[in-house]
């Protein structure tokens, strides 16, 4: 997150981190039920760990943290790397969470976001596009949903109904490492961090997010059948 601020501890209890090896964060994730996460399909890896209930970027133990393995990764069938359409994936964890003040699921919005809606995006991704500036703790940023027209003008030929754009003034954006993390609007999960221009946080190049309202049925059906 570029030019965000430290999230209040436990204010984003649905925020998850996908880790390679012992503690290499590469993507965010969102807890949507006691045993299921959502993330971006481009975050798919054969082996990874899941960390919930953690505030710090560092591997230091926190009393609220819970660690999991992914036992099933189910990318949306319409996703094709390295394209950006249908960029979502369900992850089934090896066990259910212990519900606590630090770890709680978030409800997915059934209605699509409208222009001007204020939302919160969060993550432990880079705080600049120099690739090695990471925050000490989870970052939060208020962003505004942009019109479809403005979104398409920003990225001609690259936007479809499975995406929406959101941003703020130049200098505020999600960035590398935030993928798969939550965009929460009015208390409900509206999107996932997906893509945007490089470097992050450029004028007229907003962040692009997976438009989850288009996938509510697929998410429910997939969870029910697995």
């Amino acid at each position: 997150i570029v030019n965000g601020s430290d999230c209040q501890k436990d204010a984003q209890p649905w925020q998850g981190a996908l880790l390679l090896g012992p503690n290499k964060l590469y993507c965010g994730a969102v807890l949507i039920s006691p045993q299921w996460l959502l993330t971006a399909a481009h975050c798919r890896k054969p082996v990874f760990r899941i960390r919930l209930g953690h505030h710090s970027m560092s591997p230091v133990y926190e009393s609220g943290q819970q660690m999991f393995q992914g036992i099933k990764s189910i990318p949306h069938p319409g996703y094709s790397h390295p394209g950006h359409s249908n960029d979502l994936m369900l992850i089934k964890m090896n066990r259910k969470i212990r519900d606590s003040h630090s770890v709680k699921p978030v409800e997915i919005a059934c209605d699509c976001a409208t222009e001007g809606t204020r939302c919160m995006v969060s993550g432990w991704g880079t705080t600049s596009s120099s690739h090695n500036n990471f925050p000490k703790v989870l970052q939060c940023l208020n962003i505004t949903v942009l019109s479809e027209e403005r979104c398409k003008n920003s990225y001609p030929g690259q936007i479809d109904k499975t995406m929406f754009c959101a941003g703020d003034e130049e200098g505020r954006d999600s960035c590398q490492g935030d993928s798969g993390g939550p965009v929460v609007c009015n208390g409900k999960l509206q999107g996932l961090v997906s893509w945007g221009d490089f470097p992050c946080a450029q004028r007229n190049r907003p962040g692009v997010y997976t438009n989850l309202c288009e996938f509510v049925k697929w998410i429910k059906d997939t969870m029910n059948s697995n």
Epitope: L20, G21, K24, L25, Y26, C27, A40, H42, C43, K45, P82, G83, H84, G125, T126, S130, H131, N132, Y155, Q158, S174, C175, Q176, G177, D178, S179, G180, V193, S194, W195, G196, D197, F198, P199, C200, Q202, R205, G207
Partner: antibody
Framework: EVQLVESGGGLVQPGGSLRLSCAAS????????MNWVRQAPGKGLEWVSY????????DYADSVKGRFTISRDNAKNSLYLQMNSLRAEDTAVYYC???????????????????WGQGTTVTVSS | DIQMTQSPSSVSASVGDRVTITCRAS??????LAWYQQKPGKAPKLLIY???SLQSGVPSRFSGSGSGTDFTLTISSLQPEDFATYYC?????????FGGGTKVEIK
């Protein structure tokens, strides 16, 4: 078949110019970042330039900054390297290479260059 | 710029030998290192990405390890087709930089 084919190399005098081209086929070119990498005779690999999928981010090695210009035409599935003010030390085989990392995607994961052309030879000599 | 230092610059080995090549970065690059193989007159070929992930189609006798500044490429049992030059490359930070190369020769 995924393929990159370079062209445009040749013999040029110091101070002269050349334009290299790289024709891509077998994959969705507009989704990938691209690089130019060169190799002087008997030497190792040297990264020259990078261009993101939408051309919004471009970078160069210090040794070519201000003299070389990378560009792409996604409609033509083509990558280019305009080389001006050429010097003897620019003599090398020039490769275009596909970057597996999508700088647009916001994961923190980096791959490398998975598809390379056969190379085109540039000789700068009087 | 990040400097990449490979060692040794050359190694003589026989078919069946275990060969280890090291690469050191002048600053930490996490796991974001790639290894390439290049045969004379040919383009480089990606062997390993993210320090330890094997590129599709690459034989399992090749493996990579390391994190931070120190990395290793290992060929567990050298085959005749493995005699080539090997390069490491750091990929997270521009300018991308390669190691100087390690030539694996027949003893």
């Amino acid at each position: 078949e995924v393929q990159l084919v370079e062209s445009g190399g040749g013999l040029v005098q110091p101070g002269g110019s050349l334009r290299l081209s790289c024709a891509a086929s077998g994959f969705t070119f507009e989704h990938y970042s691209m690089n130019w990498v060169r190799q002087a005779p008997g030497k190792g690999l040297e990264w020259v330039s990078y261009i993101s999928s939408s051309s919004s981010y471009i970078d160069y090695a210090d040794s070519v900054k201000g003299r070389f210009t990378i560009s792409r035409d996604n409609a033509k599935n083509s990558l280019y390297l305009q080389m001006n003010s050429l010097r003897a030390e620019d003599t090398a085989v020039y490769y275009c290479a596909r970057d597996l990392t999508s700088m647009q995607s916001r994961d923190y994961y980096y791959y490398g260059m998975d598809v390379w052309g056969q190379g085109t030879t540039v000789t700068v000599s009087s | 710029d990040i400097q990449m230092t490979q060692s040794p610059s050359s190694v003589s080995a026989s078919v069946g030998d275990r060969v280890t090549i090291t690469c050191r970065a002048s600053q930490g690059i996490s796991s974001w290192l790639a290894w390439y193989q290049q045969k004379p007159g040919k383009a480089p070929k990606l062997l390993i990405y993210a320090a330890s992930s094997l590129q599709s189609g690459v034989p399992s006798r090749f493996s990579g390890s390391g994190s931070g500044t120190d990395f290793t490429l290992t060929i567990s049992s050298l085959q005749p087709e493995d005699f080539a030059t090997y390069y490491c490359q750091q990929v997270p930070i521009f300018p991308y930089t390669f190691g100087g190369g390690t030539k694996v020769e027949i003893k």
